[in-house]
Interface confidence: low
C-alpha cells in the first residue's frame, strides 16, 4: 500500500483540505470520491457539479482538493483511489464541527426573593459534537445538570441550574459558558440576578457624638434601612411605652430634646417592604447631669477684684459600667 491520506477536522462553513498522496508514483490515475462514491476528481477533471470543490494541486504523486463552505452533510469518508494493478484505495474521514447555533439562557423568574430556589436553563442548540456547558455565579463555578438530545448527528444541550438566591446575589451575573472544539475564546451568555430582600435596619446615634446621654441633653437617632425594594415605611416606636411628648419624628430621624430619666427605654425603628419587615432597637439610658462642687473663694484685700476658682467634678452614677449606646438589629 503506497496511497496515503490524513483525516480532516473542520468547522462548519470553513475550508477542508483533502489530500491523496502516492509514495511511489507510477503515473497511475488518482481519483477522489465523495461519501456517496460519486467522483469528485478524476485526475485534474471534476465531473461533480459542486463548485465548492477546487483543485489545489495535481501531480503524479498528489491530488489535493479544497472544499469550501463545509456543511454537516459533507461529513463522512472520502475515498482516494489509485488505479494500479490491483487498484488501491484509502480513505480520509472529514469530521465537521458545528458550533452551537444559539445560546439561550432562560431564567425562571425575572425577580426572585431571598431564600428562594430558582431554575435557570441554558440551551446550546444544534452543535456537533455536544457542547459542554459551565455555570458561573460571578466568579464562582456552579454545577448544573445537562440533558443532551441528538438529531441527525447534531446535539442540543440543555443545562439546568437550581440556584438558591441570597441578598448578596442581587446584581450578580449568572453566566452560561460554552466549551466546544469549534468555539475559540469565550462563548457565553449571562443574565443578572435581581433579588428582593427584606430590610436590614441599623440605628446610628448622630447626636451626642461622644455617645453619653445626660439629663437635659438632646438625642438624635437616625434609622438606616436598606432593602429591595427600598423600604416603603420607616417608623419609630417606643417599646412597651408611649413615645415621649417632646420627641420629634422626622422621616428616619428621631429627636428627643431635654432628655430626662422618664425617657429611659427601648426605641425601635421598624422598616418594611413587600418581602418582609425588620427592626432595630436602641436602648436609651439617660445619665445624671454633671454635678458642680463649689470651691473655696480667695479674696485679696489689696485689690477690689475677687477671683473665684470653680472646680467642676463630673460624676457618673454608672461609673465603671459600659457606655450608653445600645443598638440591637433584628
Amino acid at each position: 500500500q503506497n496511497l496515503f491520506t490524513k483525516d480532516v477536522t473542520v468547522i462548519e462553513g470553513e475550508v477542508a483540505t483533502i489530500s491523496c498522496q502516492v509514495n511511489k508514483s507510477d503515473d497511475s490515475v488518482i481519483q477522489l470520491l465523495n461519501p456517496n462514491r460519486q467522483t469528485i476528481y478524476f485526475r485534474d477533471f471534476r465531473p461533480l457539479k459542486d463548485s465548492r470543490f477546487q483543485l489545489l494541486n495535481f501531480s503524479s504523486s498528489e491530488l489535493k482538493v479544497s472544499l469550501t463552505n463545509v456543511s454537516i452533510s459533507d461529513e463522512g469518508r472520502y475515498f482516494c483511489q489509485l488505479y494500479t494493478d490491483p487498484p488501491q484505495e484509502s480513505y480520509t474521514t472529514i469530521t465537521v464541527l458545528v458550533p452551537p447555533r444559539n445560546l439561550m439562557i432562560d431564567i425562571q423568574k425575572d425577580t426572585a426573593v431571598e431564600g428562594e430556589e430558582i431554575e435557570v436553563n441554558c440551551t446550546a442548540m444544534a452543535s456537533k459534537p455536544a457542547t459542554t456547558i459551565r455555570w458561573f455565579k460571578g466568579n464562582t463555578e456552579l454545577k448544573g445538570k445537562s440533558e443532551v438530545e441528538e438529531w441527525s448527528d447534531m446535539y442540543t444541550v440543555t443545562s439546568q441550574l437550581m440556584l438558591k438566591v441570597h441578598k448578596e446575589d442581587d446584581g450578580v451575573p449568572v453566566i452560561c459558558q460554552v466549551e466546544h472544539p469549534a468555539v475559540t475564546g469565550n462563548l457565553q451568555t449571562q443574565r443578572y440576578l435581581e433579588v428582593q430582600y427584606k430590610p436590614q435596619v441599623h440605628i446610628q446615634m448622630t447626636y451626642p457624638l461622644q455617645g453619653l446621654t445626660r439629663e437635659g441633653d438632646a438625642l438624635e437617632l437616625t434609622c438606616e434601612a436598606i432593602g429591595k425594594p427600598q423600604p416603603v415605611m420607616v417608623t419609630w416606636v417606643r417599646v412597651d411605652d408611649e413615645m415621649p411628648q417632646h420627641a420629634v419624628l422626622s422621616g428616619p430621624n428621631l429627636f428627643i430634646n431635654n432628655l430626662n430619666k422618664t425617657d429611659n427605654g427601648t426605641y425601635r425603628c421598624e422598616a418594611s417592604n413587600i418581602v418582609g419587615k425588620a427592626h432595630s432597637d436602641y436602648m436609651l439610658y439617660v445619665y445624671d447631669p454633671p454635678t458642680t462642687i463649689p470651691p473655696p473663694t480667695t479674696t485679696t484685700t489689696t485689690t477690689t477684684t475677687t477671683t473665684t476658682t470653680i472646680l467642676t467634678i463630673i460624676t457618673d452614677s454608672r461609673a465603671g459600667e459600659e457606655g450608653s449606646i445600645r443598638a440591637v438589629d433584628h
Epitope: 432562560d106 444544534a126 440533558e147 443532551v148 438530545e149 441528538e150 438529531w151 442540543t156 440543555t158
Partner: antibody, heavy 119, light 108 residues
Framework: EVQLVESGGGLVQPGGSLRLSCAAS????????MSWVRQAPGKGLEWVSG????????YYADSVKGRFTISRDNSNNTLYLQMHSLRAEDTALYYC????????????WGQGTTVTVSR | SSELTQDPAVSVASGQTVRITCQGD??????PSWYQQKPRQAPVLVFF???NRPSGIPDRFSGSASGNTASLTIAGAQAEDDADYYC???????????FGGGTKVTVL
C-alpha cells in the same frame, strides 16, 4: 426505517380512562423528545403533551393538565399517554411525534389512533 | 395563553407562488415549524427554524420570519402541494407548544 406506530385508541364513556401507546423503531429512541398531538374531527392540530428523552421532564397543554400523564419506556422504545376523566372534547385522532431539537419541530409522525368519548 | 393566527384558506394557480402567514406573540422570540397535512394523512414537517428544510422536502418550500409574523412560501405551487398547512411555535417561555388554526391551500 424510522417509524412510529400508535395503538390503544377506542370508544370510551365520559369520565372513563384509556392508555395510548406508541412503538418507535429505526432510531435511538432515548435521544429524542417525544410528543402527543391530537386532531379533533374536521379541526386543526392541537399539541397535547411532551416528554424529554430521559423522561425526566414532562409538559402538558392546559386543556389536559391533571387528567393526562405522559411517560416512556426507553428499554422498550415505547411512549405512553394515560388519559383519565375523559370528556367529549377529547375525541380526536391522537398522533405520536418525534421531536427535533426538543419540541421545536416534530420530524417524524405516526399515523394516529382514534379516541372517541361518547355515551 | 398565546395563540397563532393563520388565514383559513388561500388559492393559487399551478406554477404560481403562494405565501402562507402565521402571526403570534411567540413568533417574536421563536422561529416556527411548518407542517403539511393531506387528507387522511399524518402531518409532515416541511420547514423549521431560520432556514431548515428536512430532506425530501422540495426546495420550492422556504420560510421567513420578522417581528411577530412568519411566512411559508411555495414558489411554483404544484398540484401535490394542495393541503392544509400548520405553523407551530413554543408558547412564550412556557413549556407548551402552539399550533395555528391551519391554512387550506388550494392549487387551481
Amino acid at each position: 426505517e424510522v417509524q412510529l406506530v400508535e395503538s390503544g385508541g377506542g370508544l370510551v364513556q365520559p369520565g372513563g380512562s384509556l392508555r395510548l401507546s406508541c412503538a418507535a423503531s429505526g432510531f435511538t429512541f432515548r435521544s429524542y423528545t417525544m410528543s402527543w398531538v391530537r386532531q379533533a374531527p374536521g379541526k386543526g392540530l392541537e399539541w397535547v403533551s411532551g416528554i424529554s428523552g430521559s423522561g425526566g421532564s414532562t409538559y402538558y397543554a392546559d386543556s389536559v393538565k391533571g387528567r393526562f400523564t405522559i411517560s416512556r419506556d426507553n428499554s422498550n422504545n415505547t411512549l405512553y399517554l394515560q388519559m383519565h376523566s375523559l370528556r367529549a372534547e377529547d375525541t380526536a385522532l391522537y398522533y405520536c411525534a418525534r421531536g427535533l431539537y426538543g419540541l421545536y419541530a416534530m420530524d417524524v409522525w405516526g399515523q394516529g389512533t382514534t379516541v372517541t368519548v361518547s355515551r | 395563553s398565546s395563540e397563532l393566527t393563520q388565514d383559513p384558506a388561500v388559492s393559487v394557480a399551478s406554477g404560481q407562488t403562494v405565501r402562507i402567514t402565521c402571526q403570534g406573540d411567540s413568533l417574536r422570540h421563536y422561529y416556527p415549524s411548518w407542517y403539511q397535512q393531506k387528507p387522511r394523512q399524518a402531518p409532515v414537517l416541511v420547514f423549521f427554524g431560520e432556514n431548515n428544510r428536512p430532506s425530501g422536502i422540495p426546495d420550492r418550500f422556504s420560510g421567513s420570519a420578522s417581528g411577530n409574523t412568519a411566512s411559508l412560501t411555495i414558489a411554483g405551487a404544484q398540484a401535490e402541494d394542495d393541503a392544509d398547512y400548520y405553523c407551530s411555535s413554543r408558547d412564550g417561555n412556557d413549556d407548551r407548544w402552539l399550533f395555528g388554526g391551519g391554512t387550506k391551500v388550494t392549487v387551481l
